[in-house]
């Protein structure tokens, strides 16, 4: 094996081209200059190297850049990106959206890998905030990306970026995440008129407070049951029967099918049965007539 470490005569690579796929592992190691490889990384992706050969090329780059690859190399990694570990990626400083897109393209069609998650984390931290262009890019590749962020990470999303969010991007968000996103969405869409505003804000309403739901009930929005069922229970409970009726419009009939599920179940328990009966839906479980309702939370606040 020792004599194999020298590059055979006439085999020294002058450029990165397809002839290299015929090089054995040790020949690639001995005959390809790491600096040449770094300057011609864009060619690697066009050459059908074997996985074993890609391992050798990665090793050469690792030796050349022990502190992490420069962005000029990162942008052209192509398939070699799939060889990188999260530890490798943590050494990188990626600032260009074009670089991010190029690497996400390589992973397209696959689930978000630890490598991709680390890359995105490095990129967003480097930018300081999740701007609209970045969010546009990330949600295009990974619709569930937004809901994978913690509430703390979501707090760095500027309201202007909310315009890039599609309803399906919020499908897997939990209430804590929507609590952070809703005020941003409210701010982003504040200049829109009633019906247009509702179309845009609808996906975010799982983070809306009671007062905003009361305001929406005055605007003939006809909220569908699927949206209503995603509302915060604590935001729905204080709504009156009249307000819920106005909020849902013709969809109010759907309450009957959902009467055993939250937040409808808990809301019914808080309403007077007389008021529920006015809906004509046969909803049961309200407060019987003649009972006095004590708001214990109010009592605690006063004490």
């Amino acid at each position: 094996e020792v004599e194999k470490t020298a590059c055979p005569s006439g085999k020294k690579a002058r450029e990165i081209d397809e002839s290299l796929i015929f090089y054995k592992k040790w020949e690639l190691e001995a005959c390809v200059d790491a600096a040449l490889l770094a300057t011609q990384m864009d060619r690697v992706n066009a050459i059908p190297f074997t996985y074993e050969q890609l391992d050798v090329l990665k090793h050469k780059l690792d030796e050349l850049y022990p502190q992490g690859y420069p962005e000029s190399v990162i942008q052209h990694l192509g398939y070699l990106f799939l060889k990188m570990s999260p530890e490798d990626i943590r050494k990188w400083n990626v600032t260009s959206l074009e670089t991010l897109k190029a690497l996400l393209e390589v992973n397209k069609g696959h689930e978000m890998s630890p490598q991709v998650a680390t890359l995105i984390d490095r990129f967003v931290k480097g930018r300081g905030q999740l701007d609209k262009d970045t969010l546009d890019t990330l949600t295009a590749f990974y619709p569930g990306y937004l809901c994978s962020l913690s509430p703390e990470e979501l707090s760095s999303v500027p309201p202007s970026s909310i315009w890039a969010v599609r309803p399906q991007d919020l499908d897997t968000c939990d209430p804590r995440q929507l609590d952070v996103l809703y005020p941003k969405a409210r701010l982003a869409f504040q200049n829109m008129n009633g019906s247009e505003y509702f179309v845009k804000i609808q996906s975010f309403l799982g983070g809306a407070p009671t007062e905003d739901l009361k305001a929406l009930s005055q605007q003939n929005v006809s909220m569908d049951l699927a949206t209503f069922m995603k509302l915060r229970t604590d935001a729905v409970l204080p709504l009156t029967v009249a307000e819920v009726q106005k909020l849902l419009g013709p969809h109010v009939e759907g309450l009957k099918a959902e009467e055993r599920h939250r937040p409808v179940r808990d809301w019914i328990l808080r309403q007077r049965q007389d008021d529920l009966d006015t809906l004509g839906l046969g909803l049961q479980g309200g407060i019987p007539n003649g009972y006095l309702v004590l708001d214990l939370s109010m009592q605690e606040a006063l004490s």
């Epitope: 796929i21 059908p48 074997t50 996985y51 074993e52 050969q53």
Partner: antibody, heavy 117, light 108 residues
Amino acid sequence: SVEESGGRLVTPGTPLTLTCTVSGFSLSSYAMGWVRQAPGEGLEWIGTISTGGITYYASWAKGRFTISKTSTTVDLKITSPTTEDTATYFCARVGSSGYLFYFFNLWGQGTLVTVSS
Amino acid sequence: VFELTQTPSPVSAAVGGTVTIRCQASQNIKSYLAWYQQKPGQPPKLLIYEASILASGVSSRFKGSGSGTEFTLTISDLECADAATYYCQSYYAASSNAFGGGTEVVVK
């Protein structure tokens, strides 16, 4: 889809060319391989042609086979068949663009070559 | 010379049972191994790639595992339709691009 043709009975030493016709994808995006299977035996990789036209052969197949391609076909030439080359020859698409050695995710039905005097 | 050795062959089990097929590589091929199913008169069908990733449309009863030099394919809840010959294939390097000898699965 992938479809092989050209298989027939030949006498030893008579060159034979098999053709693989592809549709629904581009040969400029996928490498293609040839695999054979002798009657009652296992699968044997012969060689692969890259998107750029580079050919790579199994060590036992070098000199015995030649792979070439056009925009929609991939040919396998058996230069001087012997009785040991009697087999069903499959054409198969490499499972991802950009690789020469990879798994095969789309196969033809195969074409039978019989070499006998 | 690189070799992929499959064991055992043939292997038989009853409907509803489980079979395990092994594939041993003579060199480290990391996780670059695929499994195929072939029935008489048909071309091979890809089941698993990269040692454990299920190919599109393949039943989750098929499970691949292993890395380096030792790999296994496990078929659980055996059905009559699983009777076939199974092949492993490595694709890490040019020198190790090869198929295993095949393992016949008989379902009783």
